[in-house]
Interface confidence: low
């Protein structure tokens, strides 16, 4: 298993609506075809797998239907994008990219990115 | 010992929805790809899907698209299959297996611990 | 997407040696340099004999081999004994977390 380097900001803010963006770019040594990306998520040292995909150089991300994830891919650059978040789901939110295909299998974890998710203050008229 | 012990044989009518379950032992569940295979009476192996480590990305064959649904849960470390819409051409024996591929890294890809196979038997 | 296609059957005395062959695509075997093959007993769960076209995990006979060129893959069995009568199946990954099997060979010891 061969070291990789992958980017990603340090810190992104969610939207109101609770929807976080983020770049994540990995160094690719060689040209791959088939690339794995995993979003794991890391809080209070629990480490828990978010979303994945695996996409072909050149087509879409596909993330499951269910899934809370949605990507595109440019070169090596993997555009993310994580909804329906709430505060409690703030932490550190790490890009882990794989080159499945062709060996040699490259591995490459992020640093991570901070998403901070602020829950929407309820109306001033509300019952809350 | 390494091993993955199967959930008992099942007798189920057609139309219904049958859950297999699949309880690992003797190494580290949590960084492993699961798969299940079936195969028909006398017939051959037939992948149907596939999850991840955590459970978060999960992948099935097109034919089962929609009728079959694989989860697991870590803290039991057990991996389970359900297939739904049942129908006579669904009786077979449903293995679970354990993918040599690890999440941590590696270029292995095999099958490498099998359980002992669950008959599911679908009649009416 | 059918199964790889497997001779059906093949046979051979003690002490001989066999070659049961598997067929994919361009979308499969040749695509990918990760063909398995496994052994089956009757009644038994199978049994991974190589992984990755050619290696075999530790406890495995070097009596097994296996190759690959192109869409083809196949296992040689040499120094046949009475105990490798059985089923074997190929496996290719076929990309996008996918795998598929061969339909399967019988392998009879005469």
């Known amino acids: 298993c061969k070291a990789m380097h992958v980017a990603q900001p340090a810190v992104v803010l969610a939207s109101s609506r609770g929807i976080a963006s983020f770049v994540c770019e990995y160094a690719s040594p060689g040209k791959a075809t088939e690339v794995r990306v995993t979003v794991l998520r890391q809080a209070d040292s629990q480490v828990t797998e978010v979303c994945a995909a695996t996409y072909m150089m050149g087509n879409e991300l596909t993330f499951l239907d269910d899934s809370i994830c949605t990507g595109t891919s440019s070169g090596n650059q993997v555009n993310l994008t994580i909804q329906g978040l709430r505060a409690m789901d703030t932490g550190l939110y790490i890009c882990k990219v794989e080159l499945m295909y062709p060996p040699p299998y490259y591995l490459g974890i992020g640093n991570g990115t901070q998403i901070y998710v602020i829950d929407p203050e309820p109306c001033p008229d509300s019952d809350f | 010992q390494v091993q993955l012990v199967q959930s008992g044989a099942e007798v189920k009518k057609p139309g219904a929805s049958v859950k297999v379950s699949c309880k690992a032992s003797?190494?580290?569940?949590?960084?492993?790809?699961m798969h299940w295979v079936r195969q028909a009476p006398g017939q051959g192996l037939e992948w149907m899907g596939i999850?991840?480590?955590?459970?978060?990305?999960?992948t099935y064959a097109q034919k089962f698209q929609g009728r079959v649904t694989i989860t697991r849960d870590t803290s039991t470390s057990t991996v389970y299959m359900e297939l739904s819409s049942l129908r006579s051409e669904d009786t077979a024996v449903y293995y679970c297996?354990?993918?040599?591929?690890?999440?941590?890294?590696?270029?292995?890809?095999?099958?490498?611990?099998w359980g002992q196979g669950t008959l599911v038997t679908v009649s009416s | 997407q059918s199964a790889l296609t497997q001779s059906a059957s093949v046979s051979g005395f003690p002490g001989q040696s066999i070659t049961v062959s598997c067929v994919g695509t361009n979308s499969d075997v040749e695509a990918y340099d990760l063909v398995s093959w496994y052994r089956q007993h009757p009644d038994k769960s199978p049994n991974l004999l190589i992984y990755?076209?050619?290696k075999r995990p530790s406890g495995v006979s070097d009596r097994f081999s296996a190759f690959k060129s192109g869409n083809t893959a196949s296992l040689t069995i040499s120094g046949l004994q009475a105990e490798d009568e059985a089923y074997y199946y190929c496996?290719?990954?076929?990309?996008?977390?996918?795998?598929?099997f061969g339909a399967g060979t019988q392998l009879t010891v005469l």
């Open positions: 990755d076209n050619y």
């Open positions: 003797g190494f580290s569940f949590p960084n492993y790809y």
């Open positions: 999850i991840s480590p955590t459970g978060g990305s999960r």
């Open positions: 297996a354990r993918e040599m591929y690890n999440w941590n890294g590696g270029w292995d890809y095999g099958m490498d611990v």
């Open positions: 496996c290719s990954y076929a990309g996008f977390s996918t795998w598929i």
